[in-house]
C-alpha cells in the first residue's frame, strides 16, 4: 500500500543557474493523498531558513504530482542562494532538500556563462 505521507520531491543537492532580469519559476513537487497541505518557501540564511512572505506563488497540477511554485518576476541578484519548501501536514512540518540558485548579474557579465562555468563558481552564493 502506497504511503499517504506528504512528500516533497526537490532533488537533493540540486542547482539552477539563472540570470538577473529573467523570469524564473522555482518548483516544489508535492505528493499528497486526500488534502493538499499548506506549503511555504523559505530562503536559507546560514542554518536558519527565513520564510518568504508576500511573494507570488501558485499551484500547478499534473497527473501524479502537484507543484508549489515560487515566481521570480524578474530574478534579482539578491535572489542568489538556497531555498527550501516545507509542508504543514497533520501538525507536522515536512521539509524538502534545499535547492540552490546561482544568479549571474548580466550587467556585470560581458556574456552569459555556461551552466558548467556556473557550477565551478560556488562562491557566487556568498558574494
Amino acid at each position: 500500500k502506497e504511503s499517504c505521507d506528504v512528500q516533497l520531491y526537490i532533488k537533493r543537492q540540486s542547482y539552477h543557474s539563472i540570470f538577473a532580469g529573467d523570469p524564473f519559476k522555482l518548483e516544489c513537487p508535492v505528493k499528497y493523498c486526500a488534502h493538499r497541505p499548506q506549503v511555504t518557501w523559505c530562503k536559507l540564511n546560514g542554518t536558519t531558513c527565513v520564510k518568504l512572505e508576500g511573494r507570488h506563488t501558485s499551484w500547478k497540477q499534473e497527473k501524479n504530482l502537484s507543484f508549489f511554485i515560487l515566481h521570480f518576476e524578474p530574478v534579482l541578484p539578491s535572489d542568489n542562494g538556497s531555498y527550501r519548501c516545507s509542508a504543514n501536514f497533520l501538525s507536522a512540518i515536512i521539509e524538502s532538500h534545499s535547492t540552490t540558485l546561482y544568479v549571474t548579474d548580466v550587467k556585470s557579465a560581458s556574456e552569459r556563462p555556461s551552466k558548467d562555468e556556473m557550477a565551478s563558481r560556488p562562491w557566487l552564493l556568498y558574494s
Partner: antibody, heavy 120, light 112 residues
Framework: QVQLQESGPGLVKPSGTLSLTCADS????????IHWVRQPPGKGLEWIGR????????RYNPSFKSRATISSDKSKNQASLKLSSVTAADTAVYYC?????????????WGQGTTVTVSS | DIVMTQSPDSLALSLGERATINCKSS???????????LNWFQQKPGQPPKRLIY???KLDSGVPDRFSGSGSGTDFTLTISSVQAEDVAVYYC?????????FGQGTKLEIK
C-alpha cells in the same frame, strides 16, 4: 524495467575526443541524476561527474573538469559524455549510472559499461 | 576531496568464515539533512558494480541478509557473516555526501 546502455567508439586516437552516449529506458531522466564513472584496466572506480537532466546543471570531478563535458537530451532520454585531449591513461571501461531520487540518492542502476581504448 | 580508504586491500577466507571490510573517510559523511550517504558496491569480473547497501546499513532488495553495513561519521564496515563462493568479488565503498563523489580503492575477496 530500468536500463542504461552506454555506446560509442571503442577506439580513440591520442589527443582526440572520446564521445559516449547513455541511452536510458524504463524511467524519465529528468527525475534523476545521471553519473559517469570509469574504471581503468585492473584498477578501481573513478567518478567523472553527474548531470541534472531537468536543467542541464553539471558537477565534475576536478580531475576531469577541464576535459569532461556531460550533457543530456530529455527528448531522447539520454545523456552524453565527451572527454577531450585523451591519452593512453584514459583507456578504461566507462559506465553511466542512475542516481535514484527521494529518499536514498545513491547509484542504484548501472549500464553494462563500454570499453574505450586510446591508441594510435 | 574526500579520500575513502578501504582495508584490507584483499582478503582470502574459507567458506563460512566472517568477512569484515572497513572504509574510512577523510571527513564526516553526515549530510546537512541528517543522513549519511555511504554506500557499498559489489563488482564481479566483467560486470558493472551492483549496489549492496545504501545509507550505511540499508540492504538493497535481493541482497542476502548475510551482508550488513554499519558505522557513522568517518568509519564504516561491511560485514559478510558467512562467506559463500558467490561472494568472490571486489567491494567498493562510495560517498554521496560531498562533491566530488569518491570511491574507496576496493577490497578483493577471494576464497581460500
Amino acid at each position: 524495467q530500468v536500463q542504461l546502455q552506454e555506446s560509442g567508439p571503442g577506439l580513440v586516437k591520442p589527443s582526440g575526443t572520446l564521445s559516449l552516449t547513455c541511452a536510458d529506458s524504463g524511467f524519465n531522466i529528468k527525475d534523476t541524476y545521471i553519473h559517469w564513472v570509469r574504471q581503468p584496466p585492473g584498477k578501481g572506480l573513478e567518478w567523472i561527474g553527474r548531470i541534472d537532466p531537468a536543467n542541464g546543471f553539471t558537477r565534475y570531478n576536478p580531475s576531469f573538469k577541464s576535459r569532461a563535458t556531460i550533457s543530456s537530451d530529455k527528448s531522447k532520454n539520454q545523456a552524453s559524455l565527451k572527454l577531450s585531449s585523451v591519452t593512453a591513461a584514459d583507456t578504461a571501461v566507462y559506465y553511466c549510472a542512475r542516481e535514484d531520487g527521494y529518499p536514498y540518492y545513491t547509484l542504484d542502476c548501472w549500464g553494462q559499461g563500454t570499453t574505450v581504448t586510446v591508441s594510435s | 576531496d574526500i579520500v575513502m580508504t578501504q582495508s584490507p586491500d584483499s582478503l582470502a577466507l574459507s567458506l563460512g568464515e566472517r568477512a569484515t571490510i572497513n572504509c574510512k573517510s577523510s571527513q564526516s559523511l553526515l549530510d546537512v539533512d541528517g543522513k549519511t550517504y555511504l554506500n557499498w558496491f559489489q563488482q564481479k569480473p566483467g560486470q558493472p558494480p551492483k549496489r549492496l547497501i545504501y545509507l550505511v546499513s540499508k540492504l538493497d532488495s535481493g541482497v542476502p541478509d548475510r551482508f550488513s553495513g554499519s558505522g557513522s561519521g568517518t568509519d564504516f564496515t561491511l560485514t559478510i557473516s558467512s562467506v559463500q563462493a558467490e561472494d568472490v568479488a571486489v567491494y567498493y565503498c562510495w560517498q554521496g555526501t560531498h562533491f566530488p563523489r569518491t570511491f574507496g580503492q576496493g577490497t578483493k575477496l577471494e576464497i581460500k
